[in-house]
Interface confidence: low
């Protein structure tokens, strides 16, 4: 087994159970899961007088580490005082040690009740450019309570000094306020208060609540695709305005950014729908650098019908970052429909969602109306996954049989790009990027006379091209043929194709 | 853009106490994340002291907690660094850094040399 | 403390070569890693960070990766300015920087 350092744990008794007059009493501390032996346990019994014993270690029997117990007996006055108890185990480290101090008995005691306030926003409906948040931890028996703040589940660094703390009777309350950007209220994070007390954890958490809306209207907003952020590197966000019913009386919609900076000109365009309703749209350029770095943007619409300001923001999303996978096929040959072919890629295990999809051909991007990919779906584990499906045909095979299938995403390294290539007809082309591939030059057609081929495009044939048996040193199934130019002094070259 | 701009006495006695500030312009020290102080020594190894972020919170390395204080007058966008008790040990170049989320430094000012000599 | 060793003090490369500096962790530090360049009298300019993402308006020919506790910054092309010290950092506990790699252009 390999070298495991011990996991401690103070045993003490029950306060009410030790008689008040009990002159001495024994308390314990249990270091278990460690392995190889020893350990060696020492007591700070501070100013008074104890005598130890340690028991000799057993061997855990699952896991073959061992556990030891070293028990303090002490006498005195003994009520008021810590006790510390020092595992150190070498073989972890010449340093290991681990540090237990607690008193001879525990308490009974009430557990604190854990509550998140939050200052309100102003009578507009906008956040303030601070929020307090205001951590109650009340109805508790005194004693030790830490306070933590979390954002995400991450350690926050927060001035705990101005924790307040007063006594109600038999209990006690603690407060402790968290003051936060509106930048970071607004990115949609959650906080946690987290209080550790008699070694228990209470936590209670809050993060800013969805939007509701006056009833019948939407708002949406979108973050800048993939593409536009990492290809173009111009990336937009558009502001979604739809089910307004048209009236007089202008919809503005306004951007702004939590940094106070100032935003970019944006486009408006609107539409009337067949319903009779109005959808109103407003996209904003944002800096690649200003998305990256974690800028939130607002869009604020307004209208003399709304009872009130509906308000959207937008921030890259947060949370685990991991790379797509992506798979290409194609399907075999369908009867009825041999001069289609549909490609199909499977995208997957990537986070956060947000993902372009892309298909090249003769490296040329298709237009995105040539394929359908669905929305990222979760998969069984953490991640997204997505499916894209595009058709092609024999005249595009026959031109270049190699289909590319690109995800843009930001955890794709480096350069946000992963594609991956694929054939219609798998061995001749090459199924990926890396494969070995013949010059595009001529190709080799079905039926067509033995010994004049017909060039790539119908042009003139190629004078010295013939289609012979299968080559061994071509990848590919050997009833296919090859065309090989039979050019005097030099390598041949090769063309895969049908003949 | 963000610019920083170091100042300070450039050459302190040693076991006296050593201020330096930092004026940001282009951007207010109170609208997000995190004010630094990094040091370079003569011989290039870097070391970062600590920062003071936008609510005020600050953090220091843990070899320098009992002599480092960072400090901020908001209604002048400045920020500070008092060291104290300097020693010839703490002779580098004193860079102020905006760190725009905690984790690593985009807008460094340009330094400032600062000489601990009797 | 979490100390990054960059275990080549100098390295010597041409104009248009390919070079990868590197960086080790003494334990885990996730992808929290950031790459910085200084050029001769100047301050340090971040040019990685999370171990691969590159920093708005540096040239694509920085690519930041990670194995395990090892990480690189590799310049796919070399230019003559790109002469200058390049340090790693760690954010994954508080922060510490590399001792540095002076790049030297023949």
């Known amino acids: 087994a390999s070298t495991q350092s011990p996991s401690v744990f103070p045993l003490t008794r029950c306060c009410k159970n030790i008689p008040s007059n009990a002159t001495s009493v024994t308390l314990g501390c249990l270091a278990t899961g460690y392995f190889p032996e020893p350990v060696m346990v020492t007591w700070d019994t501070g100013s008074l007088n104890g005598t130890t014993m340690t028991l000799p270690a057993t061997t855990l029997t699952l896991s073959g580490h061992y556990a030891t117990i070293s028990l303090l007996t002490v006498s005195g006055a003994w009520a008021k005082q810590m006790f510390t108890c020092r595992v150190a185990h070498t073989p972890s480290s010449t340093d290991w040690v681990d540090n237990k101090t607690f008193s001879v008995c525990s308490r009974d005691f009430t557990p604190p009740t854990v509550k998140i306030l939050q200052s309100s926003c102003d009578g507009g409906g906008h956040f303030p450019p601070t929020i307090q948040l205001l951590c109650l931890v009340s109805g508790y028996t005194p004693g030790t309570i830490n306070i933590t703040w979390l954002e995400d589940g991450q350690v926050m660094d927060v001035d705990l000094s101005t924790a307040s703390t007063t006594q109600e009777g038999e209990l006690a309350s603690t407060q402790s306020e968290l003051t936060l950007s509106q930048k970071h209220w607004l990115s949609d994070r959650t906080y946690t208060c987290q209080v550790t007390y008699q070694g228990h954890t209470f936590e209670d958490s809050t993060k800013k609540c969805a939007d509701s809306n006056p009833r019948g209207v939407s708002a949406y907003l979108s973050r800048p695709s993939p593409f536009d952020l990492f290809i173009r590197k111009s990336p937009t966000i558009t502001c979604l305005v739809v089910d307004l019913a048209p009236s007089k009386g202008t919809v503005n919609l306004t951007w702004s950014r939590a940094s106070g900076k100032p935003v970019n000109h944006s486009t408006r365009k609107e539409e009337k729908q067949r319903n009779g309703t109005l959808t109103v749209t407003s996209t904003l350029p944002v800096g690649t650098r200003d998305w990256i770095e974690g800028e939130t943007y607002q869009c604020r619409v307004t209208h003399p019908h709304l009872p009130r300001a509906l308000m959207r923001s937008t921030t890259k999303t947060s949370g685990p970052r991991a790379a797509p996978e992506v798979y290409a096929f194609a399907t075999p040959e369908w009867p009825g429909s041999r001069d289609k072919r549909t490609l199909a890629c499977l995208i997957q295990n990537f986070m956060p969602e947000d993902i372009s999809v892309q298909w090249l051909h003769n490296e040329v991007q298709l237009p995105d109306a040539r394929h359908s990919t669905t929305q990222p779906r979760k998969t069984k584990g953490s991640g997204f996954f997505v499916f894209s499906r595009l058709e092609v045909t024999r005249a595009e095979w026959e031109q270049k049989d190699e289909f590319i299938c690109r995800a843009v995403h930001e955890a794709a390294s480096p350069s946000q790009t992963v594609q991956r290539a694929v054939s219609v007809n798998p061995g001749l082309a090459g199924g990926s990027a890396q494969s070995q591939r013949a010059p595009d030059r001529v190709l080799c057609h079905s039926g067509q006379q033995q010994g004049l081929p017909r060039a790539a495009g119908g042009s003139v044939p190629h004078p010295r091209c013939h289609c012979g048996a299968g080559r061994a040193d071509w990848p590919g199934p050997p009833e296919l043929d090859v065309c090989v130019e039979e050019a005097e002094g030099e390598a041949p070259w090769t063309w895969t194709g049908l003949c | 853009d963000v610019q920083l701009l170091e100042s300070g006495p450039g050459l302190v006695k040693p076991s006296q106490s050593l201020s330096l500030t930092c004026t940001v312009t282009g951007y207010s020290i109170t609208s997000d994340y995190a004010w630094n102080w990094i040091r370079q020594f003569p011989g290039n190894k870097l070391e970062w002291l600590g920062y003071i972020n936008y609510s005020g919170t600050t953090r220091y390395n843990p070899s320098l907690k009992s002599r480092i204080s960072i400090s901020r007058d908001t209604s002048k966008n400045q920020f500070f660094l008092q060291l104290n008790s300097v020693t010839s040990e703490d002779t580098a170049t004193y860079f102020c850094?905006?760190?725009?989320?905690?984790?690593?430094?985009?807008?460094w000012g340009q330094g400032t040399t600062l000489t601990v000599s009797s | 403390d979490i100390v990054m060793t960059q275990s080549h003090k100098f390295m010597s490369t041409s104009v248009g070569d390919r070079v990868s500096i590197t960086c080790k962790a003494s334990?885990?530090?996730?992808?929290?890693v950031a790459w910085y360049q200084q050029k001769p009298g100047q301050s340090p300019k971040l040019l990685i960070y999370s171990a691969s993402w590159r920093y708005a308006g540096v040239p694509d020919r920085f690519t930041g990766s990670r194995s395990g506790t090892d990480y690189t910054l590799t310049i796919s092309s070399v230019q003559a300015e790109d002469l200058a010290v390049y340090y790693c950092?760690?954010?994954?506990?508080?922060?510490?920087f590399g001792s540095g790699t002076k790049l030297e252009i023949q």
């Open positions: 334990q885990d530090v996730s992808i929290d």
């Open positions: 950092q760690q954010h994954y506990n508080l922060f510490t």
């Open positions: 850094v905006y760190g725009s989320s905690q984790r690593f430094f985009d807008y």
